[in-house]
């Protein structure tokens, strides 16, 4: 029987470092090895018939035990499939190796209204583009961490909001007077130093009532 395997199905490596993606196989007399890269809608062939393809040949080398990168970039993050078949036969096996190129978060950008109407919906956003794996976000009000569930802490029990740590969106619905304050957010992805945004003050104002 044929086997195709990697003892490292997930590899995490800081950007600009070398890395090897292992692929061990047995049971093939004349193995033909191909490596495919998948990331979202993108699929690229890295290695075809035991040879690195033109778009990778300057920085990837084929070895009998895997492929080795001289230096990885964030664009290399994705799933690599090692596919082994018998030359002129019908034996086949494959193994997937997930490569996560580690990049620390950059300083997040916030979108916070300087004033918002009490009783209405107010949306605050926080995002950063560099972090790999993608960052999770923590919001602060007047320097105090905002819990995911406002009812879990006395300091925020009068607030009504939904906080999504994955998207960085903070939605007040409805906004109350006590939501006035200085807001900032922190991006962290478990690699490098967590980064904090600028703090922006949001005033919760009464609705203007026409005379």
């Amino acid at each position: 029987s044929v086997t195709v395997h990697s003892s490292e199905p997930e590899v995490r490596i800081p950007e600009n470092n070398p890395v090897k993606l292992s692929c061990a196989y047995s049971g093939f007399s004349s193995p033909r090895v191909e490596w495919k890269f998948d990331q979202g809608d993108t699929t690229r062939l890295v290695c075809y018939n035991n040879k690195i393809t033109a778009s990778y040949e300057d920085r990837v080398t084929f070895l009998p035990t895997g492929i080795t990168f001289k230096s990885v970039t964030r664009e290399d993050t994705g799933t690599y499939t090692c596919m082994v078949s018998e030359e002129g036969g019908n034996s086949y096996g494959e193994v997937k190796v997930k490569l996560i190129v580690l990049v620390p978060p950059s300083k997040p950008t916030v979108n916070i209204p300087s004033s918002a109407t009490i009783g209405n919906r107010a949306v605050l956003t926080c995002s950063e583009q560099d972090g790999s794996p993608p960052s999770e976000y923590t919001w602060f009000k007047d320097g105090i961490v905002m819990p995911t569930n406002p009812k879990s802490t006395r300091a925020f029990s009068n607030s009504s909001y939904v906080l999504n740590p994955t998207t960085g969106e903070l939605v007040f619905d409805p906004l109350s007077a006590s939501d006035t304050g200085e807001y900032s957010c922190e991006a962290r992805n478990g690699y490098g130093t967590p980064m904090t945004s600028n703090a922006v003050r949001m005033e919760a104002v009464e609705r203007n009532v026409g005379v």
Epitope: T3, H5, S6, S7, E8, P9, I13, N17, P18, V19, K20, S22, A24, S26, T61, L63, P64, T65, T68, F69, K70
Partner: antibody, heavy 116, light 106 residues
Framework: QVQLVQSGAEVKKPGASVKVSCKAS????????MHWVRQAPGQRLEWMGY????????RYSQKFQGRVTITADTSTSTAYMELSSLRSEDTAVYYC?????????WGQGTLVTVSS | DIQMTQSPSSLSASVGDRVTITCQAS??????IAWYQQKPGKAPKLLIH???TLETGVPSRFSGSGSGTDYTFTISSLQPEDIATYYC????????FGQGTKVEIK
């Protein structure tokens, strides 16, 4: 035939560092990752980390991260394992081992004794 | 990390006896287990990989079986030269050894 020959026994004081070598022959050194495994007296074998000699890429066990450094010299087909901030619990036999998927060939082992 | 629990830690058997050692993984290791023999003062020697594939030159009295999380190593007829400590290694996801089984002659 494949051979992995390690450097001789070492005696070190606590806080010092030790560097063990492993010279490979009988195969293409850059084709296979070289791992280091240790065995303290009466203990199980313990994986420490590896190097891909082709590009110098390394991976370390979390337990040893920050204290172990694995390097390779492709011109002499030799891998090295350096362990710093030694303590008495680091007294062990240290092995290099070639990886196919599992470990198929091993060095003879190097006894490192840490004693004041 | 995958943990490997090997048992027994030691055993004593007579020449010609059937000897069985087990290794249990903390999760499915998809048959990626190897077995090693280590004699005092020597490096481990690979006997079996991928659950049951015998290395070239290893006597047929050694065998391996199992699937999922439970694996067995067997010496069908213990010989004096088999006195050693035996270790399992999972290599499905990184590398973890069992704690070893010391085999002695009664």
């Amino acid at each position: 035939q494949v051979q992995l020959v390690q450097s001789g026994a070492e005696v070190k004081k606590p806080g010092a560092s030790v560097k063990v070598s492993c010279k490979a022959s009988g195969y293409s050194f850059t084709d296979y990752s070289m791992h280091w495994v240790r065995q303290a007296p009466g203990q199980r074998l313990e994986w420490m980390g590896y190097i891909d000699p082709y590009n110098g890429g390394t991976r370390y066990s979390q337990k040893f991260q920050g204290r172990v450094t694995i390097t390779a010299d492709t011109s002499t087909s030799t891998a090295y394992m350096e362990l710093s901030s030694l303590r008495s619990e680091d007294t062990a036999v240290y092995y290099c081992a070639r990886q196919t998927d599992y470990f198929d060939y091993w060095g003879q082992g190097t006894l490192v004794t840490v004693s004041s | 990390d995958i943990q490997m629990t090997q048992s027994p830690s030691s055993l004593s058997a007579s020449v010609g006896d059937r000897v069985t050692i087990t290794c249990q993984a903390s999760q499915d290791i998809n048959n990626y287990i190897a077995w090693y023999q280590q004699k005092p003062g020597k490096a481990p020697k690979l006997l079996i990989h991928y659950t049951s594939t015998l290395e070239t030159g290893v006597p047929s009295r050694f065998s391996g079986s199992g699937s999922g999380t439970d694996y067995t190593f067997t010496i069908s007829s213990l010989q004096p030269e088999d006195i050693a400590t035996y270790y399992c290694l999972q290599y499905d996801n990184l590398w973890t050894f069992g704690q070893g089984t010391k085999v002695e002659i009664k």
